[in-house]
């Protein structure tokens, strides 16, 4: 060892996992959806296991029915904290057709936008968060192809509640969810028996959405 | 730019199946942000929406007709059909294919299809 | 169904003038999947407006739409000769899509 040599006490940073991800959460809030304290309960311990800010991740949140409107935009908020407290705020909108069609596509063509707040070269991920089969669904195959196209990873959940309450078939209605999940199917496709079990996915999606990253 | 051209026989017996292609130039019908649309206007009358078709062969028809239309695809020549069977006088019309992507932006010049014995 | 229905019938106009025509759907329908299509003798249509008030492309400025709901308007600021036509909206946002029964637009 050269005379030279001196040791220093160092402190290594802390690995940094840098989560830079663009995601929008596309919530069904038709007439259907009940209780919807589940679905802000849902939001708020998903959001929570986020590092929300415009260098990490960012979150904008559309919510859907017969009509589309824009929650809150990706850069709209610069900090978990106050994502939370804007998540806790959204109130169901209602409405007595499930658009989800028009959902995605107003996600993919507005929310994903610059002008939003989208970055460049940084990841696109939605999650779809529905209760019932569209009355738009014939123009699903288009919308998902566009997704597609621009490389937006897609979460798609099935809340059976509302069939389950009526003891109806979810055949059609879970094949119809899972057409919009990527492949792999299974890794991005989740169904929950009622609105209050969403709760019940929040750390097996989070992992998933955060293993995009990686 | 795209184009669209509807060919098939104008006159077709009642009873016997009609069919009709379309053949889509200046693009590709495999680009996955269209469907592909039959419709048709009966002498002077409205447009009625027959049905449509994603490249990668889904179809959607409307219930109306659902029981004697097919709506297929066929890629490699870049062209989609329709077949609508047990025609009477009722199907004489002019038939037009259509590219959907937002609204029917691309049409045919349409065909005359005359159902008669 | 969504059932369409346009009035007038028809209206005669001269070129100059303005022409408002409307569509009333018999359920709500998102504006987002509200189109106008207009119709010369012997052609097919043409895309005018989709979105229920977003021009396509090649369309004149003179052409406007608006409406939500279960009413929507499309708007003619000033007719020129080649305006004359049969108009047409249509709605694609439930299955089966369908059209209004047309609204002729005739020289007065």
């Known amino acids: 060892v050269s005379p030279t040599f001196q040791v220093v006490n160092s402190i290594a940073p802390v690995q940094e996992c840098s989560t830079q991800l663009d995601i929008v959460i596309v919530l069904d809030g038709s007439n259907s959806i009940y209780p919807w304290d589940s679905v802000t309960a849902f939001l708020n311990d998903l959001l929570e296991r986020m590092d929300i800010g415009p260098k990490q991740t960012q979150v904008g949140i559309v919510q859907y029915g017969e009509n589309v409107t824009h929650e809150f935009n990706l850069n709209k908020y610069s900090s978990t904290e106050e994502v939370l407290v804007a998540a806790k705020k959204i109130v169901q909108r209602g409405g007595r057709q499930t658009m989800t069609a028009l959902g995605i596509d107003t996600a993919r063509k507005e929310a994903f936008t610059e002008a939003r707040g989208a970055r460049r070269g940084v990841k696109k991920v939605m999650v779809i968060v529905t209760d019932g089969e569209s009355h738009d669904n014939h123009r699903l195959k288009k919308v998902i192809q566009d997704c597609e196209d621009e490389n937006i990873q897609r979460f798609s959940i099935a809340i059976l509640g509302s069939y389950n309450r009526g003891n109806l078939s979810t055949e059609k209605f879970v094949e119809e969810i899972k057409s919009i999940a990527s492949e792999p199917t299974e890794k991005h496709f989740f169904n929950v028996s009622d609105e209050l079990a969403l709760v019940t996915i929040v750390k097996t999606l989070g992992e998933r959405i955060f293993a995009l990253e990686a | 730019q795209v184009q669209l051209q509807e060919s098939g026989p104008g006159l077709v017996k009642p009873s016997q199946t009609l069919s009709l292609t379309c053949t889509v130039s200046?693009?590709?019908?495999?680009?996955?942000?269209?469907?592909w649309s039959w419709i048709r206007q009966h002498p002077g009358k409205g447009l009625e929406w027959i049905g449509y078709i994603f490249y990668s062969g889904s179809t959607y028809y409307n219930p109306s007709l659902k029981s004697r239309v097919t709506i297929s695809v066929d890629t490699s020549k870049n062209q989609f059909s329709l077949k609508l069977s047990s025609v009477t006088a009722a199907d004489t019309a002019v038939y037009y294919c259509a590219r959907d992507g937002y609204g029917m932006d691309v049409w045919g010049q349409g065909t005359t299809v005359t159902v008669s014995s | 169904e969504i059932v369409l229905t346009q009035s007038p019938g028809t209206l005669s106009l001269s070129p100059g003038e303005r022409a408002t025509l409307s569509c009333r759907a018999s359920q709500s329908v998102s504006s987002s999947y509200l189109v106008w299509y207009q119709q010369k003798p012997g052609q097919a249509p043409r895309l005018l407006l989709y979105d229920a008030s977003s021009r396509a492309t090649g369309i004149p400025d003179r052409f406007s739409g608006s409406g939500s709901g279960t009413d929507f308007t499309l708007t003619i600021s000033r007719l020129e000769p080649e305006d004359f036509a049969v108009y047409y909206c249509q709605q694609y946002g439930n299955s089966p899509l369908t059209f209004g029964g047309g609204t002729k637009v005739e020289i007065k």
């Open positions: 200046g693009g590709s019908i495999s680009r996955g942000n269209y469907y």
